[in-house]
Amino acid sequence: SEVEYRAEVGQNAYLPCFYTPAAPGNLVPVCWGKGACPVFECGNVVLRTDERDVNYWTSRYWLNGDFRKGDVSLTIENVTLADSGIYCCRIQIPGIMNDEKFNLKLVIKPAKVTPAPTRQRDFTAAFPRMLTTRGHGPAETQTLGSLPDINLTQISTLANELRDSRLANDLRDSGATIRIG
């Protein structure tokens, strides 16, 4: 079954997907699509990379991480209820039946009418279970979506603020990771 991710209307949603290139710059094509992964490619493609660059994208969909290092996590800007559903991340690894496919379920909740409390800046205090979920296996690792009651948009925002820190690296490594080579 799909791993579930949540965001609120008006926020940015974050759907993690990672692989480890065999060598720096040795990229493989990746596609993101709305709908479960079909036999090949992605249905209703919203973003695509090739061996060098992002070669197709649609408005509101972008890669916030360093895709040249294998971070192909999708950010959906300013989500609406219509963005709910299954998304496919497909890593098109050369070879016989090597493609890696991840179906991620995005649930969009209506925006809270009550003002949000001041955001906690201490990452480990805000998400005490976060750093226990890291995985370094060669296949799919524990993902953020399996942790209950965590606002992934908030995590994504914090990750951006802490991009150069070790905590951000921990966050980035916690998504589905494929090592190639």
């Epitope: 709908g35 036999v39 249905g43 209703n44 050369p94 016989i96």
Partner: antibody, heavy 120, light 107 residues
């Protein structure tokens, strides 16, 4: 417009290897965006997907043929090929090569098909 | 593997009539279903992809509908060149599979 043409022997002996080539014209086989596939149709019967190789080098084989099947690309000749080993009479069919546009699947191109008979 | 069952096996109609062809999947294929037309001695021709989208160059009289397990191909008014065999194909799960076909013949 992409055009495809199958070529290969029309008669193969049992236990031998069936080899077919599909020559692509009107486009480069190495350019991104296409899946190069093989499908077959037994006489008077329906269609059976054999497998494909993608522009990125991903290869998928149908499980029932996987142990006997090889699909490969020769970019220098703008061709892709099918090799099916240890053939029997059950492999007698019209073999089609085809290309599928990966950018939305809204068009595909097929060869005219070639009949391969397995018989001694 | 996913089994696609097409009905009826044969449809006898006259030019100008409406043809309705059915395809049922043994499990959900979402909207990843295509329809092909095949005439004797010719390769299949893609008509519909993703259940309801007409392929490039396909006339508007061809339409597809459905999702999940039940799909329909409709030809609103049969032209003489439409008499052929029609196959559905699922692209949801490997291996790709085709239905057994529906032959649309002249009444």
């Amino acid at each position: 417009q992409v055009q495809l043409q199958e070529s290969g022997p029309g008669l193969v002996k049992p236990s031998q290897t069936l080899s077919l080539t599909c020559t692509v014209s009107g486009g480069s086989i190495s350019s991104g965006g296409y899946y190069w596939s093989w499908t077959r149709q037994h006489p008077g019967m329906g269609l059976e997907w054999i497998g494909y190789i993608s522009y990125s080098g991903s290869i998928y084989y149908t499980p029932s043929l996987k142990s006997r099947l090889t699909i490969s690309v020769d970019t220098s000749k703008n061709q892709f090929s099918l090799k099916l080993s240890s053939v029997t009479a059950a492999d007698t069919a019209v073999y089609y090569c085809a290309s599928l546009d990966s950018w939305g699947s809204n068009r595909d191109y097929w060869g005219q098909g070639t009949l391969v008979t397995v018989s001694s | 593997e996913i089994v696609l069952t097409q009905s009826p096996a044969t449809l006898s109609l006259s030019p100008g009539e409406r043809a309705t062809l059915s395809c049922r999947a043994s499990q959900s294929v979402s909207s990843y279903l295509a329809w092909y037309q095949q005439k004797p001695g010719q390769a299949p021709r893609l008509l519909i992809y993703d259940a309801s989208n007409r392929a490039t160059g396909i006339p508007a009289r061809f339409s597809g509908s459905g999702s999940g397990t039940d799909f329909t191909l409709t030809i609103s008014s049969l032209e003489p060149e439409d008499f052929a065999v029609y196959y559905c194909q699922q692209r949801s799960n490997w291996p790709l599979t085709f239905g057994g076909g529906t032959k649309v013949e002249i009444k």
